[in-house]
Interface confidence: medium
């Protein structure tokens, strides 16, 4: 009764294994000769040599022997500091990047079956960027007070610097601080400049937006891909390797569709108040036949900072007072095409494509930093009138303050979002065979190997 | 559709060196080894030898050793045979084939006639 | 090298006969034999791969068998287009080689 028992047990077990693997029957095991022309399964490759389908070998190992007509493939374990990522039949595993650098973080441990990613620590960027992990880390631009961050530092792109506009400062060295609005004052003491906030005298100030540095966030890296980095002025030390791109004009540009509506509302809300203030004058004349001062404090408009970058403000217009401490600086690029329309999402610029005379392709955030309010550009302007008696020439003066807030270019066709600039995807020109036993897993990437190593599989699996 | 496409006929004098080649199309062309084979006027085949496409590495049969040099174009998925110090016998229908365990595709066969 | 010797040279049969070729290996070529069919001013064209398994498109008169040394081609019914030279060869081992050919010709 036994050996029956022992038959059976073997029996299911065959039974279970078959329906384990469900092969076709004719052709169960490794090595078989496929019919010509046809492919191999998954997980078999084709060796021209032995005219076979053959096993592969799993992650984690390697081809050790390879197949001949009657004995299957031979795979063994890597070594210490080798691996092999894919299903292959490779005669050698590939060896594990170098250890990280100070200025790397080591995102994934070298192991059997993966190989050692480094990525840049906070504060660094990814300036030589490999297929997986970074080469070469910088670190991320500071600018200097004067300047504020126009785009800012991503796992793969240093931080752009810009000049801050007209009505706007930064007064601090670093990679995160924008440039903010100066605060408005009913009396100005020290008018504001690009590093340096306007001062006050008495009377609590107000402020065109909330107050405070705008932080942005600071990158961490992940996943690298490279990105022509763009030099922009700043005190910061910037690595030798990223050339100067020679003088542009000047900062967003000169010209633009939003001088006309801005023009407009300026012009308009000064004449309604020259009006009044004519009326109020002619009034005052006839009641109290007293001469009249008419005192106009016109305040600068002023943007939200960084406010819809799609659109170009007064500010960057250069339309209203230019503070005397401001700048534009030759490196700064010209609004083009591609400044409006780079999208954020770590697109790569490829090595060696340049955005179109602007050196640099400027990332757009597509909605405002500090607003919630959308893609519309918001001018503030406050005006302040004072219609003062001057008899007696005591200051009696009854203020009036206008204050308009327009939404002028809130188009969606305008919002940079979703528009994709095609940027050529140079990460895989750089994969040599070296580097990706891929090319050996079932690929059948049409360039001749050295001559060790083993044919291509029949078709992809 | 598969297709091999060889070059056209050649007439060599003695001592010459020839040059086919064979272009494929319609399939993988590292996927397949090439196997060069020949056949004289009346007569059986003869296998001259294969290249390993994906490698570039050829094996000659022992009869065209010194002879004969297999090489691809693989950017061209291109397969070329140049036979040396041809003579009077080497006057045959050259044909390219893919693969080795039963070839399943052949060239139309390119005449090279050896002639004084 | 191997040898491979076809018989007969020639077969003489009629359209709706049946033809069986010979092709004997000098060594052991375990299963790795093919079948072709060869017209004239043609290419040759593959009929059975690996002994007896029958290539796409092939029609199903025509069987292989055989193993080791002795192989088989066996076509059932002779149609007209069935007229021409067939040749085995062997891709067991360096430097691969085929049979003289048989003939097969209308009686």
């Known amino acids: 009764m036994a050996p029956v028992a022992v038959w059976a047990a073997l029996a299911v077990g065959l039974e279970l294994w078959a329906a384990a693997h469900a092969l076709p029957a004719q052709v169960a095991f490794t090595p078989y000769a496929p019919e010509p022309g046809s492919t191999c399964r998954l997980r078999e490759y084709y060796d021209q040599t032995a005219q076979m389908c053959c096993s592969k070998c799993s992650p984690g190992q390697h081809a050790k022997v390879f197949c001949t007509k009657t004995s299957d493939t031979v795979c063994d374990s890597c070594e210490d500091s080798t691996y092999t990522q894919l299903w292959n039949w490779v005669p050698e595993c590939l060896s594990c990047g170098s250890r990280c650098s100070s200025d790397q973080v080591e995102t994934q441990a070298c192991t059997r079956e993966q190989n050692r990613i480094c990525t840049c620590r906070p504060g660094w960027y990814c300036a030589l960027s490999k297929q997986e992990g970074c080469r070469l880390c910088a670190p991320l631009r500071k600018c200097r007070p004067g300047f504020g961050v126009a785009r800012p530092g991503t796992e793969t792109s240093d931080v752009v610097c810009k000049p801050c506009a007209p009505g706007t400062f930064s007064n601090t060295t670093s990679s995160t601080d924008i440039c903010r609005p100066h605060q408005i004052c009913n009396v100005v003491a020290i008018p504001g400049n690009a590093s340096m906030d306007a001062v006050c005298t008495s009377t609590s100030p107000t402020r065109s937006m909330a107050p405070g540095a705008v932080h942005l966030p600071q990158p961490v890296s992940t996943r690298s891909q490279h990105t022509q980095p763009t030099p922009e002025p700043s005190t910061a030390p910037s690595t030798s390797f990223l050339l100067p791109m020679g003088p542009s004009p000047p900062a967003e540009g000169s010209t633009g569709d939003f001088a006309l509506p801005v023009g407009l509302i300026v012009g308009v809300t000064a004449l309604g108040l020259l009006i009044i203030g004519v009326v109020n004058c002619v009034i005052m004349t006839q009641v109290k036949k007293k001469p009249l001062c008419l005192q106009r404090e016109a305040k600068v408009p002023h943007l939200p900072a960084d406010k819809a970058r799609g659109t170009q403000g007064p500010e960057q217009q250069h339309l209203l007072i230019t503070a005397p401490s401001s700048s534009s600086s030759s490196l700064e690029s010209s609004a083009s095409a591609l400044d409006r329309r780079a999208p954020t999402r770590n697109q790569p610029q490829a090595p060696g494509v340049e955005a179109s005379g602007a050196g640099e392709a400027r990332a757009s955030t597509g909605s405002s930093d500090s607003s919630p309010g959308g893609h519309g550009t918001q001018v503030n302007v406050t005006c302040i009138v004072n219609v003062c008696s001057s008899s007696d020439h005591s200051s009696q003066c009854s203020s009036q303050a206008s204050s308009t807030m327009g939404d002028t270019d809130s188009s969606p066709s305008e919002s940079p979002k979703d528009e994709q600039v095609p940027f050529s995807k140079e990460e895989c020109a750089f994969r040599s065979q070296l580097e990706t036993p891929e090319t050996l897993l079932g690929s059948t990437e049409e360039k001749p190997l050295p001559l060790g190593v083993p044919d291509a599989g029949m078709k992809p699996s | 559709q598969i297709q091999l496409v060889q070059s056209g006929a050649e007439v060599k004098k003695p001592g010459a060196s020839v040059k086919v080649s064979c272009k494929a199309s319609?399939?993988?062309?590292?996927?397949?080894?090439m196997s060069w084979v020949r056949q004289a006027p009346g007569q059986g085949l003869e296998w001259m030898g294969w290249?390993?496409?994906?490698?570039?590495?050829?094996t000659y049969a022992d009869d065209f050793k010194g002879r004969v040099t297999f090489t691809l174009d693989t950017s061209t998925s291109t397969a070329y045979m140049e036979l040396r110090s041809l003579r009077s016998d080497d006057t045959a229908v050259y044909y390219c084939?893919?693969?080795?365990?039963?070839?399943?595709?052949w060239g139309q066969g390119t005449l090279v006639t050896v002639s004084s | 090298e191997i040898v491979m010797t076809q018989s007969p040279a020639t077969l003489s049969l009629s359209p709706g006969e049946r033809a069986t070729l010979s092709c004997k290996a000098s060594?052991?070529?375990?299963?790795?034999v093919s079948w072709y069919q060869q017209k004239p001013g043609q290419a040759p064209r593959l009929l059975i791969y690996?002994?007896?398994n029958r290539y796409t498109g092939v029609p199903d008169r025509f069987t292989g068998s055989g193993s080791a040394t002795d192989f088989t081609l066996t076509i059932s019914s002779l149609q007209p287009e069935d007229f021409a030279v067939y040749y085995c060869?062997?891709?067991?081992?360096?430097?691969?080689?085929f049979g003289q050919g048989t003939k097969l010709e209308i009686k």
């Open positions: 084939a893919r693969g080795l365990y039963g070839v399943d595709y």
């Open positions: 319609g399939y993988t062309f590292t996927t397949y080894g």
């Open positions: 290249i390993h496409t994906y490698s570039g590495v050829p």
């Open positions: 060594e052991n070529v375990v299963t790795y």
């Open positions: 690996g002994a007896s």
């Open positions: 060869g062997q891709s067991y081992t360096y430097p691969y080689t």
